[in-house]
């Protein structure tokens, strides 16, 4: 059942390379490399590079653990991002400026354009650029649930830091819900963690994309660096294959 | 590099069985099966069976995912449990009865007896038996930090349920800290999740082992079923091997 | 000129020898190996006369077991009924019919192989692949296999018909 | 997935998890493990074909990568994917011990 | 662990992760992947001895189980343990796409 023989390292490398050739095409569900005849000259658009870098950064931060991989996860996922609705939009007027929370709203039509069917979504992350933070802060993320209620999602303990840093929250379930519902605009709330005893519940952390009236240090708004949803989904044209291939086995 | 030939299923099974013989002894760091000359007659003690069942239940609830397994995790872990200090102990008097929290204290000498060195601990779980619950409740777990401060550890959303159910919190890091420090008694607090706006912060859930003056339905105290720490650790006599065996490879 | 070959004796190994050129080098490869595209290495030639297993299809769950024949060349396999060729469950998929690769492997089309031993006017003669001889027991179970040019036919006993998917004679269900 | 649900109910010849119950007394001749009396260890078995990819790929062959060589190995091998631990009770002298052994039960396999 | 830190700096003959950088253009003849230009795919290679356990066990043999056959396989095999994904950018027509391919980079191996 096991054979030991002198191993031709070059042959093994060649076989690994050849297997990768098939693997990549297979993961992309391509029968052959795509034609490049329409590719415009010049570098990749800025937005595409930013998206690629976001994805690459996420990978670097991921623990390298093997997960049992359902068939759907074997295939490549298209990565898109949807920026938060800008803060001058009227939706924000309904939510009173408070010292303990900031609000982030998203246009579901943009989400649906990126991911037409909820079942296609494999991961959604809310990404926030936190600016420097002087004290430790415990924050909580909520999802807008019904008219004026919020549903707790997760929390994070933020250590003090002199440099800006991306925060990432897994919101796959929530975005899948939004894609299933009819709403036009949906949102999150980031709040200070309020303990039952304590009365100091101010949100100390500054998130890029908000002109915070709370304190003197206004956060610079870089369009691309305001909060966004990073989406990983099976492209629609690849989706018809997704039913289990067990009958093929 | 790969050979396909008719497979003798019986031989494979025999080889697997033989490999398991070595694997179990190897995981227990035994050179041969232990002598059974001192084993007392009769069934296993109740406490041992309860501990075995606790461990087995934990396994059933665990997701069957392979984790990259450091050398230390390959070897068997001894399982012990340390019960919470009973509620009539004077330590509880220092913490005023409140509607939003319950307190659980543990004797660190008992912990040290079970796990003499912090490095030997591979997992610690706080196990609580929650009695039936009429409404959904969001609870938070805190660790007693300094004189009168508490450090947030984790949270859980408890669904309504008609039957009692064990809750389990991973508190490995905290117990490892306790084993490193000199304190005699250490504790946790289970609290209702308090939102910054909401004022209804009552802990609705009943935990076995507390005579709750808050409501009329007194929880029955079963000694073995009061909160406890389930500890998994490398036995001290097995620990000297724990330095990396890389030089042996 | 730098003599790369003496500078790095491992160049071209393990399946060839290094030959220095003005400003470069090439690999002279051992028998059964051919230079890589840049001529800086040697790779195994899957010679058309190598004999391996011929696999019937890739639909079967156990295509490693769906062996049509065990001792056939890549041409005999892929230019006739095979979907893949190889051994030890290590498979070279046969090129898709009508692709450039198919024409290169099977210049005379489905059912024919080139016979390099017979040369007419300097051109290798093509010969019909005798599927019955190569795959008879696998492709015409319970029937009589008759070679045709190109292809084959399978004749079944009275009350049986030939199932082209199962490649066997099947009882007519009356 | 090549798990017990699928493999135990099929006649899969390729890589799959295979049933194997180990009775400590009968199979290993051991009387020293007091609980459990045995366990479903299972094991992985079956070929994982290596497909030499050609430059001209086609869907039929590519579809096989997912099951037969998802990790694009040079020599794919049928190995455990999901594993579970096994708690045991045994005596050291007069003292009963409960110990947990990691990764003892094979729940599913994969070509890797 | 049989990871890049250990394996790349040692001359380990047994199961270990081996260095392999794939340049899409040079190694695969592909010009269609715009980012990255290549990646450290790596691979697993090396024997995982099967040790027939004898009833009379002894520490030397048992010590080998951890590395060479921790899963007590009937035919242990050197396979990836920790894997990482690879994001790529390529064009479909005039439209650039960012896609993530799971389990593409081998970070460590194990005998399984």
């Amino acid at each position: 059942l096991s054979t030991c023989k002198t191993i031709d390292m070059e042959l093994v490398k060649r076989k690994r390379i050849e297997a990768i050739r098939g693997q990549i095409l297979s993961k992309l569900r391509l029968a052959s490399p795509p034609s490049q005849g329409e590719v415009p000259p010049g570098p990749l658009p800025e937005a595409v590079l930013a998206l690629y870098n976001s994805t690459r950064d996420r990978v670097a931060g991921e623990s390298a653990e093997p997960e049992p991989e359902p068939e759907a996860d074997y295939y490549a996922k298209e990565v898109t991002r949807v920026l938060m609705v800008e803060t001058h939009n009227e939706i924000y007027d309904k939510f009173k400026q408070s010292t303990h929370s900031i609000y982030m709203f998203f246009n579901t039509s943009e989400l649906r354009e990126a991911v037409p069917e909820p079942v296609l979504l494999s991961r959604a992350e809310l990404r926030l650029l936190r600016l420097k933070l002087k004290v430790e802060q415990h924050v909580e993320l909520y999802q807008k649930y019904s008219n004026n209620s919020w549903r707790y999602l997760s929390n994070r303990l933020l250590a003090p830091s002199d440099s800006p840093e991306w925060l990432s929250f897994d919101v796959t379930g929530v975005v899948r819900q939004w894609l299933s519902r009819g709403g036009e605009i949906e949102g999150f709330r980031l709040s200070a963690h309020c303990s039952c005893d304590s009365r100091d519940n101010t949100l100390q952390v500054d998130i890029n994309g908000f002109t915070t009236g709370r304190r003197g240090d206004l956060a610079t708004i870089h369009g691309m660096n305001r909060p966004f949803l990073l989406l990983m989904a099976t492209p629609l044209e690849r989706a018809q294959h997704l039913q289990s291939s067990r009958h093929r086995r | 590099l790969s050979t396909c030939k008719t497979i003798d299923m019986e031989l494979v099974k025999r080889k697997r069985i033989e490999a398991i013989r070595g694997q179990i002894l190897s995981k227990l760091r035994l050179a041969s099966p232990p002598s059974q000359g001192e084993v007392p007659p009769g069934p296993l003690p109740e406490a041992v069976l309860a501990l075995y069942n606790s461990t087995r239940d934990r396994v059933a609830g665990e997701s069957a995912e392979p984790e990259p397994e450091p050398e230390a995790d390959y070897y068997a872990k001894e399982v012990t449990r340390v019960l919470m200090v009973e509620t009539h102990n004077e330590i509880y008097d220092k913490f005023k009865q409140s509607t939003h929290s319950i307190y659980m204290f543990f004797n660190t000498s008992e912990l040290r007896e079970a796990v003499p060195e912090p490095v030997l601990l591979s997992r610690a779980e706080l196990r609580l038996l929650r009695l039936k619950l009429k409404v959904e409740q969001h609870v938070e777990l805190y660790q007693k930090y300094s004189n009168n401060s508490w450090r947030y550890l984790s949270n859980r959303l408890l669904a309504p349920s008609d039957s009692p159910e064990w809750l389990s919190f991973d508190v490995t890091g905290v117990v490892r800290q306790w084993l490193s420090r000199g304190g005699e008694i250490e504790g946790f607090r289970l609290s209702a999740h308090c939102s910054c706006d909401s004022r209804d912060n009552t802990l609705q859930v009943d935990i076995n082992g507390f005579t709750t003056g808050r409501r009329g339905d007194l929880a029955t105290i079963h000694g073995m079923n009061r909160p406890f720490l389930l500890l998994m650790a490398t036995p001290l006599e097995r620990a000297q091997h724990l330095q990396s065996s890389r030089h042996r490879r | 000129d730098i003599d790369e070959c003496s500078q790095d004796p491992s160049l071209c190994l393990p399946h060839g020898a290094c030959k220095n050129l003005q400003g470069s080098y090439v690999c002279v490869c051992d028998e059964g190996f051919t230079p890589t595209q840049d001529q800086h290495g040697c790779e195994e030639v899957e010679q058309p006369h190598h004999k391996k297993e011929c696999y019937l299809n890739f639909d079967d769950t156990v295509f490693c077991d769906s062996v049509l024949a065990t001792n056939v060349t890549q041409q005999e396999c892929c230019c006739s009924l095979g979907a893949g060729w190889g051994d030890h469950c290590e498979i070279y998929p046969c090129p898709v019919y009508s692709s450039a690769e198919f024409h290169s492997l099977c210049p005379d089309g489905k059912g024919y192989t080139q016979d390099n031993n017979i040369v007419n006017y300097g051109i290798p003669a093509h010969r019909d692949i005798d599927e019955c001889m190569l795959f008879g027991s696998e492709i015409c179970k319970e029937g009589k296999c008759v070679n045709t040019q190109p292809g084959y036919e399978c004749y079944c006993k009275q009350g049986f018909y030939y199932d082209g998917n199962l490649l066997e004679c099947v009882d007519v269900d009356e | 997935a090549l798990d017990t649900n699928y493999c135990f109910s099929s006649t899969e010849k390729n890589c799959c998890v295979r049933q194997l119950y180990i009775d400590f007394r009968k199979d290993l001749g051991w009387k020293w493990i007091h609980e459990p009396k045995g366990y479903h260890a299972n094991f992985c078995l079956g070929p994982c074909p290596y497909i030499w990819s050609l430059d001209t790929q086609y869907s039929k062959v590519l579809a096989l990568y997912n099951q037969h060589n998802p990790g694009a190995s040079a020599a794919p091998c049928c190995v455990p994917q999901a594993l579970e631990p096994l708690p045991i009770v045994y005596y050291v002298g007069r003292k009963p011990k409960v110990e947990q052994l990691s990764n003892m039960i094979v729940r599913s396999c994969k070509c890797s | 662990a049989l990871d890049t830190n250990y394996c790349f700096s040692s001359t380990e003959k047994n199961c270990c992760v081996r260095q392999l950088y794939i340049d899409f253009r040079k190694d695969l003849g592909w010009k269609w992947i715009h980012e990255p230009k290549g990646y450290h795919a790596n691979f697993c290679l090396g024997p995982c001895p099967y040790i027939w356990s004898l009833d009379t066990q002894y520490s030397k043999v048992l010590a080998l189980y951890n590395q060479h056959n921790p899963g007590a396989s009937a035919a242990p095999c050197c396979v990836p343990q920790a894997l990482e994904p690879l994001p790529i950018v390529y064009y479909v027509g005039r439209k650039p796409k960012v896609e993530q391919l799971s389990n593409m980079i081998v970070r460590s191996c194990k005998c399984s």
């Epitope: 034609s35 490049q36 005849g37 590719v39 000259p41 010049g42 570098p43 | - | - | - | 010009k31 715009h34 064009y91």
Partner: antibody, heavy 119, light 107 residues
């Protein structure tokens, strides 16, 4: 193997028109963008025009914009350059080349065809 | 338009010499630069793509480096067949432009 053969060059008077062709073989023509590059006698290389694989996108150098059009017939594996209102400074050897994706490197070239604009 | 300035415009060297040709862009073009070799009466031939990558079949004595605005083509040991004119080309933006060329002659 890849082959590109230009034709249609010759002597033409200023203000007149000329149509160059480039016949391609040995590769899937429609999968590749194509370019025309010219070289005036004794001078350097100058990019003239490019066209995407389907013909949907075209690009031109400022010096020829409005006078030259580039087109392709994928069924005939042929690339064209229609040159109108020719000037003396258009005199050059005209090369067609294949475009490799990404960095737009020109990996295969034809042997060139000479266009002389002279009265 | 992006201008590419090559220097020197010509040079004389002997077989075995190390030769370096530079190309400077009027603005940053990242690594979007290619190098071509052209012999009299022949079509140009791609040597280096993306600033530093050797095209398949090109001898390893040719190498490219640089990024942004300054780029270099190096021939580590000049061979008789290397006497030719060398051009850099930017593909960062349309119009695609070439440098003026560097003629390498026999000393």
């Amino acid at each position: 193997q890849v082959q590109l053969v230009e034709s249609g060059g010759g002597v033409v008077q200023p203000g007149r028109s000329l149509r160059l062709s480039c016949a391609a073989s040995g590769f899937t023509f429609s999968d590749y963008a194509m370019v025309w590059v010219r070289q005036a006698p004794g001078k350097g290389l100058e990019w003239v025009s490019a066209i995407s694989g389907s013909g949907a996108a075209t690009y031109f150098a400022d010096s020829v914009k409005g006078r030259f059009t580039i087109s392709r017939d994928n069924s005939k594996n042929t690339l064209y350059l229609q040159m109108n209102s020719l000037r003396a400074e258009d005199t050059a050897v005209y090369y067609c080349a294949t475009v490799s994706s990404g960095h737009w490197d020109f990996d295969y070239w034809g042997q060139g065809t000479l266009v002389t604009v002279s009265s | 338009d992006i201008q590419l300035t090559q220097s020197p415009s010509s040079l004389s060297a002997s077989v075995g010499d190390r030769v370096t040709i530079t190309c400077r862009a009027s603005q940053s073009i990242s690594s979007y630069l290619n190098w071509y070799q052209q012999k009299p009466g022949k079509a140009p031939k791609l040597l280096i793509y993306a600033a530093s990558n050797l095209q398949s079949g090109v001898p390893s004595r040719f190498s490219g480096s640089g990024s942004g605005t300054d780029f270099t083509l190096t021939i580590s040991s000049l061979q008789p067949e290397d006497f030719a004119t060398y051009y850099c080309q930017q593909t960062y933006t349309v119009p695609l432009t070439f440098g003026g060329g560097t003629k390498v002659e026999i000393k």
